[in-house]
């Protein structure tokens, strides 16, 4: 988890801090977006359960040229124990529906807030 705090971090970041920072970034995205996030790009929806962080990254990493989510992509990579590349889908990632990136971020944010309230930081 060393890299979760970004370049300014002097050492390992507590999971609670990393999760809070990810939540803050998603809040920032949803509040500051004027036009549709990533101009309507659609990504695979995910099950917000075990393996959620890797699944979220696997979905979002396919979107290129959208600067608004680049920091989120980097932060999610810190939560995922394996390297994720575009076009890669784990068995946890059931491809049954696509949604706009904006909706994906909202859904993810709601779930992460719930996890934070419940003290589930990993």
């Amino acid at each position: 988890l060393t890299c979760l705090g970004g370049f300014a971090s002097p050492g390992p970041v507590p999971p609670s801090t990393a999760l809070r920072e990810l939540i803050e970034e998603l809040v920032n995205i949803t509040q500051n977006q004027k036009a549709p996030l990533c101009n309507g790009s659609m990504v695979w929806s995910i099950n917000l359960t075990a393996g959620m962080y890797c699944a979220a990254l696997e979905s979002l990493i396919n979107v290129s040229g959208c600067s608004a989510i680049e920091k989120t992509q980097r932060m999610l990579s810190g939560f995922c124990p394996h390297k994720v590349s575009a076009g890669q889908f784990s068995s946890l990632h059931v491809r049954d529906t696509k949604i706009e990136v904006a909706q994906f971020v909202k859904d993810l944010l709601l779930h992460l807030k719930k996890l934070f309230r419940e003290g589930q930081f990993n």
Epitope: P36, C38, N39, G40, S41, M42, V43, N62, V63, S64, G65, C66
Partner: nanobody
């Protein structure tokens, strides 16, 4: 420059069929998954279907499963959507899109109206 041109829409009665086409240019068509997305009047975007680059894997929204069939002809750089058993709620502008692209790169869409 990515260019997508949809065609085949029109007015059809409930229970009828239509076949939409999407002619693609400006990119290596057989290297990309492709989507069909629709927008009903006054509504948001709704994903309809996705097909893998080689056409072997297809995915459908629950609302169209069993009625719509996505396919592609990579030799013609063309994407298709066969729409059967059409319902009033299928009325929308249908867009084809290179998978994960923003709507900056979508075509102008083709209007499908299902009405008696």
């Amino acid at each position: 420059e990515v260019q997508l041109l949809e065609s085949g829409g029109g007015l059809v009665q409930p229970g009828g069929s239509l076949r939409l086409s999407c002619a693609a240019s400006g990119f290596t068509f057989d290297e990309y998954g492709m989507d069909w997305v629709r927008q009903a009047p006054g509504k948001g975007l709704e994903w309809v279907s996705t097909i893998s680059p080689n056409g072997q894997s297809t995915y459908y929204a629950d609302s169209v499963k069993g009625r719509f069939t996505i396919s592609r002809d990579n030799s013609k750089n063309t994407l298709y959507l066969q729409m059967n058993s059409l319902r009033v709620e299928d009325t929308a502008v249908y867009y084809c899109a290179k998978e994960y692209d923003s709507f900056d790169y979508w075509g102008q869409g083709t209007l499908v109206t299902v009405s008696s």
